[in-house]
């Protein structure tokens, strides 16, 4: 006799208004009396519609939450698994049931903002900027909302960057406990003459940090051969172990690059008679503290002019 189990009921993908953080939820299947005491597991698969691969979750819960790109539609499917001790060791699964979440097509794509860029400056404040849609009326203005886990609901930007009295960016500070988790942004717009398409962005703040440049550069030469270059990590909340550095060294007309995770570097002069020796440095958050980052601006250049007399450095 073939054992059968029903799929879950009322599978749906819900948007609680958190800018891309969606709820996938369902109800238990109708289970025949024989299997009432059995443990049910659910195999959930979901993806953005343009994705090649499904994310797969096995759970006993009746809800699963995750972040999605709301610029694209979402599809999911789910089936019931009966635990093997209820089925004499055989694997029993229900058919799949499917659900989808369609994106709003309100407003043409040309009305959506362009070139959204966000930088988390020195791990302290976030600046996002955008350009207006390609074809919008002059009365169009944009509004930015954001959410991350820990906030009760999506918040609107309170400090807009403006150009010609239009919002073209937003500055956010005091983002408590907002790193190492998805940060969701929606920029929507309004015009009396046409609907405006919303734009969604999701990232993690630690991956878009742009530190301040290193400071207090110092160069010393021992035995007229051994060079030691030192610099200080910039001030702010980023600990020294989170930095990686790129150094450009110039000896007379020759220059070369080097890299280190430390805030000093030793090397030998290429030529004893070199007249001047200079270096400058920039930094970025390293692989210990983020998956990615943005290089700081270059520091000021520091030079050692070489020993040419008692008045020299």
């Amino acid at each position: 006799l073939e054992i059968k189990v029903n799929p879950p009921q009322d599978f749906e993908i819900l948007d609680p208004g958190l800018l891309g953080y969606l709820y996938l939820q369902w109800k238990p299947p109708v289970v025949i009396e024989k299997f009432k005491g059995c443990t049910l597991e659910y195999e959930l698969k979901y993806r953005n519609v343009d994705s090649d691969s499904w994310k797969t979750i096995i759970t006993r819960n009746l809800i699963y939450k995750d972040g999605f790109d709301l610029n694209k539609g979402i599809e999911g499917k789910i089936r019931t698994h009966l635990s093997e001790h209820c089925t004499n060791g055989s694997e029993v699964q229900s058919p799949w049931i499917e659900a989808s979440y369609g994106i709003s097509d309100e407003g043409s794509l040309e009305t959506k903002i362009q070139d959204m860029k966000c930088i988390y400056y020195n791990w302290q404040y976030l600046v996002c900027s955008w350009k207006p849609g390609k074809t919008v009326y002059s009365d169009t203005n944009y509004t930015m909302f954001f959410w991350y886990e820990g906030l009760d609901h999506a918040l609107q930007c309170a400090d807009y960057l403006q150009h010609d009295e239009k919002n073209v960016g937003c500055k956010l500070s005091n983002l408590d406990s907002s790193d190492y988790k998805d940060f969701f942004i929606c920029v929507n717009g309004s015009s009396k003459l046409e609907p405006i398409r919303s734009s969604y962005t999701v990232f993690q703040l630690q991956n878009i940090v742009k530190p301040l440049p290193p400071e207090f550069l110092h160069i010393s030469v021992e035995n007229s051969i051994d060079i030691r270059m030192k610099w200080s990590t910039p001030g702010g909340p980023i600990p020294p172990r989170c930095y990686t550095y790129e150094i450009v060294i110039r000896e007379d007309d020759i220059s070369w690059e080097s890299a280190t995770d430390k805030n000093d570097m030793k090397l030998k002069r290429r030529a004893n008679e070199s007249e001047d020796l200079c270096f400058f440095v920039r930094c970025k958050v390293n692989i210990y503290c983020a998956d990615d980052g943005i290089w700081s601006e270059w520091s000021e250049e520091e030079c050692w002019e070489g020993y040419t007399g008692p008045d020299s450095k």
């Epitope: 790193d179 172990r241 989170c242 503290c289 983020a290 998956d291």
Partner: nanobody
Framework: QVQLQESGGGLVQPGGSLRLSCAAS????????MGWYRQAPGKQRERVAG???????VYAASVEGRFTISRDNAKNTGYLQMNNLKPEDTAVYYC?????????WGQGTQVTVSS
């Protein structure tokens, strides 16, 4: 208290392979990067490979193409696959798990490459 334990070191002939493991006693892998360092007698400790929490990797020029770093967050374990080993790879190998809040080092495992 989080502890890191390296294993997999030993004596191997030139051209041989070893796989080092670094097991963490606590759940510190999720948001932290992980690196393998080595220190040969009389030399400074150097990083040979690193991997971010999301899987981005960096390698020292001397091991590029021969060593592969990987991680299994579910097992709180990192790995260093070392192929085509050379005598100059002889050193004590240490693993490090670090992040904005954390910085932990293992006790080290000896790797000796000799015929």
């Amino acid at each position: 208290q989080v502890q890191l334990q390296e294993s997999g070191g030993g004596l191997v002939q030139p051209g041989g392979s070893l796989r080092l493991s670094c097991a963490a006693s606590g759940s510190i892998f999720n948001t932290n990067g992980m690196g393998w360092y080595r220190q040969a007698p009389g030399k400074q400790r150097e990083r040979v490979a690193g991997i971010s929490s999301g899987g981005n990797t960096v390698y020292a020029a001397s091991v590029e193409g021969r060593f592969t770093i990987s991680r299994d967050n579910a097992k709180n374990t990192g790995y260093l696959q070392m192929n085509n080993l050379k005598p100059e790879d002889t050193a004590v190998y240490y693993c490090r798990v670090a992040g904005r809040q954390d910085d932990y080092w293992g006790q080290g495992t000896q790797v000796t490459v000799s015929s």
